[in-house]
């Protein structure tokens, strides 16, 4: 990561391409992540998105990218961040201190209309996606699949 401080941060609600909300619930002293339809007028959970610039030549990164990328961390509540668990193909909320581990960083993609996708920094080609009403890690095999609805999300500040 180029800078240890984010270039910007803001609060937004996260929803799927099909307008289901991503919600976070405290259960047995740990947080669970759900994908669900909210009732009318039900308040959406907010996530703090922190954006970082990543700068590297392609020969260092191994991901074929030369230049700048936008990395993001997602925190729905103080001291908890979304983490990629690549072994379990799962997305989890972990309590941790800064500096955050690489598993908490996701490369932001927003080349598909007004949706965004989150690619694991630790596992290029693997994205946060929706599976069985939960968030999971989904391997995207080809460029065409980058437009697959289950890895597309919407950000809203309202």
């Amino acid at each position: 990561i180029t800078g240890i401080s984010p270039i910007t941060e803001y609060l937004a609600s996260l929803s799927t391409y099909n307008d289901q909300s991503i919600t976070f619930a405290l259960e047995d002293e740990s947080y669970e992540i759900y994908v669900e339809d909210l009732k009318k007028d039900e308040k959406k959970d907010k996530v703090l998105l922190s954006y970082y610039e990543s700068q590297h030549p392609s020969n260092e990164s191994g991901d074929g990218v030369d230049g700048k990328m936008l990395m993001v961390t997602l925190s729905p509540t103080k001291d908890f961040w979304l983490h990629a668990n690549n072994k379990e193909h799962s997305v989890e909320l972990h309590k941790c201190e800064k500096p955050l581990p690489d598993q908490a960083f996701f490369v932001l993609h927003n080349m598909h209309s007004n949706c965004v996708s989150f690619e694991c920094k630790t596992d290029p080609g693997v994205f946060i996606g929706v599976k069985d009403n939960h968030l999971a890690l989904i391997k995207v095999d080809s460029s065409e699949n980058l437009c697959t609805e289950n890895i597309l999300f919407k950000l809203s500040e309202t």
């Epitope: 803001y10 927003n110 080349m111």
Partner: antibody
């Protein structure tokens, strides 16, 4: 170094079509979207649309929907912008532009072609 | 579509002056605003991105501020090469939209 080389100036009659090319070099072509922005003489900048070279998906400004087609050829790292049913108001310099960040347009457009002047006149 | 309103449309200033240009979005665009400089017959040049981040190679006399709907570009001490037209652009959602431009002229 990173550069975008555009095709030369065109003079077209009303009702005709024009196809402008933009050849990219010096970077990983499929990692960056390509945007098209036009500027009529003495006027401001107007965004026309974007193509994602990775899969070829496009997003067009409503104003140009149905008249514009953006395509890409990954084998030559070239994108194309075709505008049909030309009218005199389409006389402008057409720029291709690459975003500052891979996969995202949030950080602005930092690499621009020199522009292609398209003149529509009977 | 998000409308971007830039003001003033032109400003006359002298070398050494401090120049401020404002840009207002018709709805919130988070911090995703870029500023460009354009000289006659040339392509635009990115100066500022994400509202306040200085693009590599751009002199530090240029600065950006603001978030949400109201943004400002400041040139702290105008230099002869800064006489040009400046555009803001929202990079939050498609369609991307530009302000109408501000021409900085020699007084």
């Amino acid at each position: 170094q990173v550069q975008l080389v555009q095709s030369g100036a065109e003079v077209k009659k009303p009702g005709a079509s024009v196809k402008v090319s933009c050849k990219a070099s010096g970077y990983t072509f499929i990692s960056y979207g390509m945007h098209w922005v036009r500027q009529a003489p003495g006027q401001g900048l107007e965004w026309m649309g974007e193509i994602n070279p990775h899969g070829g998906s496009t997003s067009y400004a409503q104003k140009f929907q149905g008249r514009v087609t953006m395509t890409r050829d990954t084998s030559t790292s070239t994108v194309y912008m075709e505008l049909s049913s030309l009218r005199s108001e389409d006389t402008a310099v057409y720029y291709c532009a690459r975003p500052s960040a891979a996969y995202s347009h949030y950080l602005g457009l930092d690499i621009w072609g020199r522009g292609t002047l398209v003149t529509v006149s009977s | 579509d998000i409308q971007m309103t830039q003001s003033p449309s032109s400003v006359s200033a002298s070398v050494g002056d401090r120049v401020t240009i404002t840009c207002r979005a018709s709805q919130g665009i988070s911090p995703w605003l870029a500023w460009y400089q354009q000289k006659p017959g040339k392509a635009p040049k990115l100066l500022i991105y994400a509202g306040s981040s200085l693009q590599s190679g751009v002199p530090s006399r240029f600065s950006g501020s603001g978030s949400g709907t109201d943004f400002t570009l400041t040139i702290s001490s105008l230099q002869p090469e800064d006489f040009a037209t400046y555009y803001c652009q929202q990079a939050n959602v498609f369609p991307l939209t530009f302000g109408g431009g501000t021409k900085v002229e020699i007084k």
